[in-house]
């Protein structure tokens, strides 16, 4: 929902929590502010404080219930109002009609390791967090693997298009140290994003044998 | 290998009510969404609502809610679709299927419910 | 709720040709729409989801796209397992709705 120079955007992490970020040019630091929601079937509602992440824009997440728990479903929407307090009374700033299932962004995957590694390859998996069991198996993964004297932004992205928790990198060079990470995304949601990276996993490859090629 | 095994067919007279099952063998009933489907002869399909066994939540068309009631047995991995108040036309064939709450990934084999005074 | 309109609701085709199946969306449903095929006496099956996911196990000559509210499926080398009914299926608006079906013959 954008207002002027208002932007006022939200995810839903599948489960049981909707991160909120505001945006406002102009807007007094000081000011107290929250984000309000309100499903349309539910008996709940639920509200959490915005606090700055720069200088004119402020973050919250509105924690439903259990990190497990499914708090929404695929018909349930939620009128989500960033109010700012003035004085004694609060003014409504921004409001929106969230389709939670519309708008997700999983958690980062978690639980990453080595389940083998050798000279040239290393075979990694790792555990999605905080999934709705909705998805089945309809999500996707990217990741990425850092070389020695490479940035992140300078790795290729592999794409794994099904619901696939482990990978083989293959034609790795030996006794080296990488890190890895990676990413979910499920294909519901018309404006649905990249989970964020996952924490990077440190390994290093085997170093070649004496005398002959592995 | 997913399976979903429904009940055999039905004849009911009007007014009656009809409860047909839905075994599942292959996945984790408990985490799963049930969804019930009718089609009737000639026509179309039409969406009649989901059980979703985590949640413990129902949700029903508009058309169909009055009459219809989704129950789940999580200790014998079976779903049921109850449809009350039968007229004539609800002679048709339902289904159930498991899926997310969006699309329909694998379906029963239909039973066919026939109302007939 | 939304009507989902698929035309036309008979297509004669050849085996070996190219089939292409037309479902229109009433309203606005960005890529909600799913595809089954269904044979006589048999359960639906699902083809493709968010109008262009293939589900695995699929063959590959069927494929799915869309432009606005207009979704086709395409079957690129007609098979005569592929003689069935097709139906989309929309997912956006409470309560989810299917198309009419279009009823793919022999030519």
């Known amino acids: 929902a954008v207002n002027g120079t208002s932007r006022f955007t939200c995810f839903y992490n599948s489960r049981a929590n909707i991160s909120c970020v505001w945006s406002q040019d102009g807007a007094l630091q000081d000011t107290s502010c929250q984000v309000h929601a309100w499903p349309d079937r539910r008996r709940w509602n639920q509200t959490c404080e915005l606090l700055p992440v720069s200088q004119a824009s402020w973050a919250c997440n509105l924690i439903l219930g259990t990190p497990d728990s499914q708090k929404l479903t695929a018909v349930d929407i939620v009128t989500l109002r960033v109010m700012c307090r003035e004085g004694v009374r609060w003014r409504m700033m921004a409001i929106q009609d969230f389709k939670p299932f519309e708008n997700l962004r999983l958690m980062a995957p978690i639980s990453l390791q080595v389940v083998h590694v050798e000279t040239h390859r290393c075979n990694i998996s790792w555990k999605i967090s905080q999934a709705s069991h909705y998805f089945e198996r309809h999500l996707e993964f990217e990741a990425r693997t850092l070389s020695p004297g490479h940035t992140w932004e300078e790795a290729p992205l592999m794409t794994l298009k099904q619901k696939q928790e482990w990978i083989c990198l293959e034609t790795l060079t030996p006794d080296t140290q990488y890190e890895f990470q990676v990413r979910v995304k499920p294909l519901q949601g018309e404006f649905t994003t990249w989970s964020p990276w996952s924490q990077p996993l440190a390994f290093r490859t085997k170093p070649a044998a004496l005398g002959k090629d592995t | 290998e997913v399976q979903l095994v429904q009940s055999g067919a039905e004849v009911k007279k009007p007014g009656a009510t009809v409860k047909i099952s839905c075994k599942v063998s292959?996945?984790?009933?408990?985490?799963?969404?049930i969804h019930w489907v009718q089609q009737a002869p000639g026509k179309g399909l039409e969406w009649m609502g989901w059980?979703?066994?985590?949640?413990?939540?129902?949700e029903y068309a508009p058309g169909f809610q009055d009459r219809v009631t989704i129950t789940a047995d999580t200790s014998t991995d079976t779903a049921y679709m109850e449809l009350s108040s039968l007229r004539s036309e609800d002679t048709a064939v339902y289904y159930c299927?498991?899926?997310?709450?969006?699309?329909?990934?694998?379906w029963g084999q239909g039973t066919t419910v026939t109302v007939s005074s | 709720e939304i009507v989902m309109t698929q035309s036309p609701a008979t297509l004669s085709v050849s085996p070996g040709e190219r089939a292409t199946l037309s479902c229109r969306a009433s309203?606005?449903?960005?890529?909600?729409l799913h595809w089954y095929q269904q044979k006589p006496g048999q359960a639906p099956r699902l083809l493709i989801i968010?109008?262009?996911q293939s589900i695995s196990g699929i063959p590959a000559r069927f494929s799915g796209s869309r432009s606005g509210t207009e979704f086709t499926l395409t079957i690129s080398s007609l098979q005569s397992e592929d003689f069935a009914v097709y139906f989309c299926?929309?997912?956006?608006?409470?309560?989810?709705?299917f198309g009419q079906g279009t009823k793919l013959e022999i030519k």
């Open positions: 299927a498991r899926g997310g709450p969006w699309f329909l990934s694998y």
């Open positions: 292959g996945f984790n009933f408990k985490y799963s969404l």
């Open positions: 059980i979703d066994n985590e949640a413990g939540e129902t």
């Open positions: 309203q606005i449903i960005s890529n909600n």
């Open positions: 968010y109008g262009l």
């Open positions: 299926q929309q997912s956006n608006n409470f309560p989810w709705t």
